[in-house]
């Protein structure tokens, strides 16, 4: 199994993957296979109302760049100790003996995996080729972001040989064959999106290649600078009873997804008032309504908030509310 895989994002469309060769390989490592797939945002993000008081915005950070060649401060695997910056104590004889036993066990276990669990398989090289491996049940890796996870997993025992279905039916997962190095820059990715990356070491560069059990890491690309900005005009329609319907377009390709909109408006000479518009409410009304406005000139600005943070405020939109009998000064959603 490739060791200590770490992943970082250095741009909104790239993830850099680095790893170390297996400690006790079976034969010579001829190449590595790296597969990646986009991870869907948690479905609860689409349902929850992030305008509710006390509900914190979901924390989603991208995977920051390496601090140094060996730094794993932002990228600890599940198996690593996070005790801090202290130096390690000298090892005792019993610890050294224990490590030798573990190393021996790992070698034996990898031999077992090679000979018993895994069936040699054919793959064609190059990005975009079919992945004919046994389907694995996706593990929940929790919130991915500035922590990447290295998870060696054992595939289910396949009933058939090399013709099982890819992870998602009809989906050809992109992959890259890496020769003579322990790193890869994965490009052409979507901004502020989580990816699950699978890494295997292979020791036979033939159609019947033999590859290790996979190690997994997760990473998120960096946000795109203006992706959360509302483009196009904020329009308005004035209805009976001084109800003003404000409308705007959702950002086309936001960072992750838009969780809420902030509407900031004020009557000339008055203080600014705020309205929070959730995903669901925006979807229902294509904007929001201001109800029972007092007569006067108004200006409105709107900004979107995505998983990556706030977009920019729109340019102010102006409208005039005429005098209306029996109007309480209030806003409406």
């Amino acid at each position: 199994v490739p060791l200590d895989p770490i992943s970082v994002s250095n741009s909104s469309s790239q993830i850099i993957l680095k790893w170390k060769p297996p400690s006790d390989p079976n034969g010579n490592i001829t190449h590595y296979l790296v597969f990646w797939e986009r991870q869907a945002e948690d479905s609860e993000l689409f349902e929850l109302d992030y305008c509710l008081k006390g509900l914190k915005l979901p924390s989603r950070t991208w995977s920051p760049p390496f601090e140094s060649e060996d730094s794993q401060k932002h990228n600890q695997s599940e198996y690593e100790d996070s005790a801090g910056e202290c130096c390690s104590c000298p090892k005792t004889d019993s610890q050294i003996l224990k490590e030798l036993e573990e190393s021996s066990f790992r070698k034996t276990f990898e031999d077992y995996l090679h000979n018993v669990v895994f069936v040699p398989r054919k793959t064609s090289s190059g990005t975009g080729a079919e992945d004919p491996r046994p389907s694995r049940k996706r593990r929940s890796l929790g919130d991915v972001g500035n922590v990447t996870v290295a998870v060696p997993t054992v595939a289910a025992f396949p009933n058939t040989s090399s013709t099982s279905v890819p992870t998602s039916p009809e989906e050809h997962r992109p992959f890259e064959k890496v020769v003579n190095k322990e790193s890869l820059v994965i490009s052409g990715l979507r901004h502020f999106t989580g990816y699950r990356i699978e890494l295997q070491a292979c020791n036979q560069d033939t159609p019947e290649e033999r590859c290790s059990v996979a190690a997994y890491v997760s990473a998120r690309t960096m946000p795109e600078a203006k992706a959360d900005d509302i483009v196009g005009p904020v329009t308005h329609e004035i209805f009976e009873n001084n109800v003003v319907h404000l409308m705007w377009q959702e950002p086309k390709e936001p960072n992750g997804l838009i969780v809420l909109y902030e509407v900031s408006y004020r009557r000339y000479g008055d203080e600014e008032l705020h309205l929070c518009v959730s995903r669901k409410h925006f979807a229902l009304e294509r904007g929001c309504r201001l109800r029972g406005l007092s007569p006067g000139n108004y200006s409105v600005r709107i900004r979107a908030t995505s998983l990556a943070g706030n977009g920019s405020w729109t340019e102010p939109t102006y409208f005039y509310v005429t005098d209306y009998l029996d109007v309480p000064s209030n806003i409406a959603k």
């Epitope: 109302d49 509710l52 008081k53 705020h274 929070c276 669901k280 229902l284 009304e285 309504r289």
Partner: antibody, heavy 118, light 112 residues
């Protein structure tokens, strides 16, 4: 003047289907989300379903999920509720109502009665 | 779902006398932007409901100033300063802060 008129109610056997309609006039129908709210005999009000202004987003109460379908035809200014697999507990007066987010419903129809009985 | 509890469920009053209805929610109705979406509806026998009050204390147009809404957080009150014949029927509170919208069980205002 805003008007909402429901039709399509009646007596139906359990397990059967019924389709309610709500004709809207006096406002820009395509600008508003619309709801169905029901009231069982002698009971309180229960929200049933909502549909967005364009018809692309729909939400349902748990009690009707998978059995009822809300839809709309903006060209006809009409809201619909397709009710399948009806149960005795669906017996109620069904109202269509105009959505005002946060403020609930600013205009209601007169209601149409649905009775589910064998 | 947010549970709305009204009391009393039945309120016998004499014409010209005041009346008060209480509504309590299982969760705070204060939205993230500071607004509180608590509304009151009135339903006369055989008619559809009509909204009287929105956002705790704002009267809909055409609603007489005899009706006053108050409260905050989870506790709300609808007061009628002098009950008139037109007021009899059922009053419902409804919250519009949390999804889905939910109603109280209703308070029946009856002639004493």
């Amino acid at each position: 003047e805003v008007q909402l008129v429901e039709t399509g109610g009646g007596v139906v056997q359990p397990g059967r289907s019924l389709r309610l309609s709500c004709a809207a006039s006096g406002f820009t129908f395509s600008s508003y989300a619309m709801h169905w709210v029901r009231q069982a005999p002698g009971k309180g009000l229960e929200w049933v379903a909502v549909i967005s202004y364009s018809g692309s987003n729909k939400y349902y109460a748990d009690s009707v999920k998978g059995r009822f379908t809300i839809s709309r035809d903006n060209s006809k200014n009409t809201l619909y509720l397709q009710m399948n697999s009806l149960r005795a507990e669906d017996t109620a007066v069904y109202y269509c109502a105009r959505h005002e987010w946060g403020f609930g419903f600013d205009y209601w129809g007169q209601g149409t009665t649905v009775t589910v009985s064998s | 779902d947010v549970v709305m509890t009204q009391s009393p469920l039945s309120l016998p009053v004499t014409l010209g006398q005041p009346a008060s209805i209480s509504c309590r929610s299982s969760h705070s109705l204060v939205y993230g932007d500071g607004n509180t979406y608590l509304n009151w509806f009135h339903q006369r026998p055989g008619q559809s409901p009509r909204r009287l009050i929105y956002k705790v204390s704002n009267r809909d147009s055409g609603v007489p100033d005899r009706f006053a809404g108050s409260g905050s957080g989870t506790d709300f009150t609808l007061k009628i300063s002098r009950v008139e014949a037109d007021d009899f029927g059922v009053f419902y509170c409804m919250q519009g802060t949390h999804w889905p919208y939910t109603f109280g069980q209703g308070t029946k205002l009856e002639i004493k």
